[in-house]
């Protein structure tokens, strides 16, 4: 996260750190708990990932340094990538991880609500992007979970900033015109969380952008409300 500040324990209890163990263990992407066996993240996180066996999901984590060899984690049973996904910038950048075991909800690990399709016209004014990613484009993964408050940008405005791309209604953008605060490398797959009527909603999944926190280059997120039916179909399948 560029221009962010350190989070405190339990502030974002739905945020997980997804690790790969191949060739060595490291943070790969963020993700969000949306059910006791389900993590919502970005499809692009799985480029080069051949098997769910190399993935580990850590919940209730504030500092990456808490993760040691004996730290408990959730194995991944299945990676479900949207079948229309090709690359982040074309949309459909959404994936579900089905965990091998269920998450026991506590103050430090619990789900975030999905937005309701009836709330499509809600104007969210309290949105935060979180993650352990870089603080600038050439940096390293951060130890402490960072947060930054970022305003949503209309799709019309976002399209003006990305003329070489098609910003669809299935994407949502956030950023300051002057830049300065944004997601960055290692934050992808994580949540864009917005508080509305005292309830936190998973409005976006960190997907792509040109550079990090650049002027007139907002971050582009998967617009979760447009995938609620897909999420329900996949998570409720027998």
């Amino acid at each position: 996260i560029v221009g962010g500040t350190a989070s405190v324990r339990g502030e974002w209890p739905w945020q997980v750190t997804l690790h790969t163990t191949s060739p060595t263990q490291r943070h790969l992407c963020g993700g969000s708990i949306i059910g006791n066996q389900w993590i919502l993240t970005a499809a692009h996180c799985f480029y080069g990932v051949e098997s769910p066996k190399i993935l580990r999901v850590y919940s209730g984590i504030l500092n990456q340094s808490e993760i040691k060899e004996d730290t408990s984690f959730f194995g991944v049973q299945e990676i479900i990538i949207h079948d229309q996904y090709k690359m982040a910038e074309s949309g459909y950048d959404i994936a579900l991880l089905k965990l091998e075991t269920t998450v026991n909800y506590t103050d430090s690990q619990r789900p975030i609500s999905l937005p309701s399709k009836g709330d499509r016209n809600v104007i969210y004014t309290d949105c935060w992007v979180t993650g352990w990613g870089y603080r600038k484009l050439r940096d390293k993964i951060q130890n402490t979970l960072q947060k930054a408050k970022i305003p949503l940008v209309t799709n019309e405005e976002c399209q003006k900033r990305y003329r070489g791309h098609k910003i669809t209604h299935k994407m949502i953008c956030a950023g300051y015109r002057e830049g300065g605060k944004d997601a960055c490398k290692g934050d992808s797959g994580g949540p864009l969380s917005c508080k509305h009527n005292e309830v936190w909603h998973l409005v976006g999944i960190t997907s792509w952008g040109e550079g990090c926190a650049q002027r007139e280059r907002p971050g582009v997120y998967t617009n979760v409300v447009e995938y609620v039916d897909w999420i329900l179909e996949k998570t409720q399948a027998v």
Epitope: G48, M87, G164, S188
Partner: antibody, heavy 124, light 107 residues
Framework: EVQLLESGGGLVQPGGSLRLSCAAS????????MHWVRQAPGKGLEWVSS????????SYADSVKGRFTISRDNSKNTLYLQMNSLRAEDTAVYYC?????????????????WGQGTTVTVSS | DIQMTQSPSSLSASVGDRVTITCRAS??????LGWYQQKPGKAPRLLIS???TLQSGVPLRFSGSGSGTEFTLTISSLQPEDFATYYC?????????FGQGTKLEIR
């Protein structure tokens, strides 16, 4: 088919200028970082310059800074390298290459597609 | 600037041999390293991205490992078509820097 095709190379005198082009086809050019890489006869690969997808950010090797200018025209799917004040040591095969980067993803994709190269010879 | 030191600069080996090429970065580059193969008169070809991900179409005898400052490319059992020059390239920052190359020759 994904392809990069360089052109514009040739023989030029020291102090002269040349403009290289790289025509892209088979992919969405405007979504990729583009690079110029060169290789002097019998030598290794040397990165020369790169440009961001929108063209707003450019970088140069110290050896060409102030003499070479990279640019792109996304409407024409073409990358350029304007080379001024050419020196004998600029003699090389010049390759263009594409590189995908998602600024938010902790993953290095590499330069996965290269052109066949165009030869620049600087000699009197 | 990050310097990439590749070793050895040349290597003689036989078909069937196991070969290892090393690249050392002067600073921490995470996993932002690619390995390239180049044959005479041809453009380089990306073999491995992100230090260890094999590109599609690249034979499984090639593998990459390492992170931070130490990286290796291993060819488990050399085939005749593997005799070429190999380069590492750091993609962490600008200027991008290549290793000096390793020329793999038939013994």
């Amino acid at each position: 088919e994904v392809q990069l095709l360089e052109s514009g190379g040739g023989l030029v005198q020291p102090g002269g200028s040349l403009r290289l082009s790289c025509a892209a086809s088979g992919f969405t050019f405007s979504r990729y970082i583009m690079h110029w890489v060169r290789q002097a006869p019998g030598k290794g690969l040397e990165w020369v310059s790169s440009i961001s997808p929108s063209g707003g950010l450019t970088s140069y090797a110290d050896s060409v800074k102030g003499r070479f200018t990279i640019s792109r025209d996304n409407s024409k799917n073409t990358l350029y390298l304007q080379m001024n004040s050419l020196r004998a040591e600029d003699t090389a095969v010049y390759y263009c290459a594409r590189e995908f980067e998602n600024a938010y993803h902790y993953y290095y994709y590499g330069m996965d597609v290269w052109g066949q190269g165009t030869t620049v010879t600087v000699s009197s | 600037d990050i310097q990439m030191t590749q070793s050895p600069s040349s290597l003689s080996a036989s078909v069937g041999d196991r070969v290892t090429i090393t690249c050392r970065a002067s600073g921490d580059i995470g996993n932002a390293l690619g390995w390239y193969q180049q044959k005479p008169g041809k453009a380089p070809r990306l073999l491995i991205s992100d230090a260890s991900t094999l590109q599609s179409g690249v034979p499984l005898r090639f593998s990459g490992s390492g992170s931070g400052t130490e990286f290796t490319l291993t060819i488990s059992s050399l085939q005749p078509e593997d005799f070429a020059t190999y380069y590492c390239l750091q993609g962490y920052n600008y200027p991008r820097t290549f290793g000096q190359g390793t020329k793999l020759e038939i013994r």
